[in-house]
């Protein structure tokens, strides 16, 4: 099949006191190989500070996956989610406060 770029969506949720979990989800992409990882101040986070979901079919002939990490509340602006798929790449910030989901379709 032809390349379908992912929709990337960054969300935040409350974790323990003073911390939040930020999750970067990529969906509706093809082929299945995708890089999704968190950066702090432009530097990649180590594997042991991130959690990944498996790359799974989403039922439409495309795939979905996610990566999450726990950060200190108030430091959201230092973190970005990096996505690389089929030679294209993009970075996605953490939404501030209780804002809505941020969807970015990468072309």
């Amino acid at each position: 099949g032809s390349t379908v770029p992912p929709m990337v969506n960054v969300t935040r949720s409350e974790a323990s006191e003073g911390n939040i979990t930020v999750t970067c989800r990529a969906s509706s992409f093809y082929p299945r190989n995708i890089i999704l990882t968190w950066r702090q101040d432009g530097v990649s986070l180590s594997h042991d500070t991130q959690q990944w979901g498996d790359v799974l079919p989403d039922g439409n002939g495309t795939y979905q996956t996610w990566v999450a990490t726990r950060i200190c509340r108030g430091e959201e602006q230092r973190f970005t989610c990096y996505m690389e798929h089929s030679g294209n790449h993009s970075t996605h910030p953490v939404p501030s406060g209780n804002s809505h989901h941020h969807h970015h379709h990468h072309h």
Epitope: H47, D48, G53, D54, V55, T65, Y82, H85, G87
Partner: antibody, heavy 120, light 107 residues
């Protein structure tokens, strides 16, 4: 067919800088990370750093102050520059493609390496 | 940095033998471990990734296992072309670090 080939000066004088080029074929640099790894004579492997598809870089903190990695996507080339070389920088320098998929991160294809000797 | 230790620096075995190479990390690395083979001419090849996954083209006589801090590479039936030095490598924390290598020779 994925290939990487390093080219370097061979001999570098102490305190001088080192420049090595890695020329790749069979894949696009916009969609793959490339790593630099070195191996001193008779010793093990040491990761120096990497450059991502978007040009962002990560470095081994022990060498970060002396290292710079850059690339030219159109020429399919990655460049390693290291300053203030000393004799213990004598090593074989490898570039290797990185595959970074979720829980999996590995160097799936390596160049043959280029030998750099630091000596006056 | 995480220290990777391969306590056996060299070993001799006969063709057809089962060979096991051990690798220990200075802290838990959550299966974030790869194995590489370096031939006498310096050529490096990926053998095993993520503890036990075999890349395409690598013979099935190679296998990997382990968890926590202790990992191993097994060659089930030693062949002449397996004469090489084998390195483990962790990527749980940056920087990725390698073991000192285990050289396999023919008895």
């Amino acid at each position: 067919q994925v290939q990487l080939k390093e080219s370097g000066p061979g001999l570098v004088a102490p305190s001088q800088s080192l420049s090595i080029t890695c020329t790749v074929s069979g894949f696009a640099l916009t969609g793959s990370g490339v790593n630099w790894v070195r191996q001193p004579p008779g010793k093990g492997l040491e990761w120096l750093g990497m450059i991502w598809g978007d040009g962002n870089t990560d470095y081994n903190s022990a060498l970060k102050s002396r290292l710079s990695i850059s690339k030219d996507n159109s020429k399919s080339q990655i460049f390693l520059k290291m300053n203030s070389l000393q004799t213990d920088d004598t090593a074989r320098y490898y570039c290797a493609r990185g595959a970074h998929y979720g829980k999996r991160w590995y160097f799936d294809v390596w160049g043959a390496g280029t030998t750099v000797t630091v000596s006056s | 940095d995480i220290q990777m230790t391969q306590t056996t620096s060299s070993l001799s075995a006969s063709l057809g033998d089962r060979v096991t190479i051990s690798c220990s990390a200075s802290q838990g690395i959550n299966n974030y471990l790869n194995w590489y083979q370096q031939k006498p001419d310096g050529t490096v090849k990926l053998l095993i990734y993520y503890t036990s996954s075999l890349p395409s083209g690598v013979p099935s006589r190679f296998s990997g296992s382990g968890s926590g801090t202790d990992y191993s590479l097994t060659i089930s039936n030693l062949e002449p072309e397996d004469i090489a030095t084998y390195y483990c490598q962790q990527y749980s924390k940056l920087p990725p670090t390698f073991g000192g290598g285990t050289k396999v020779e023919i008895k």
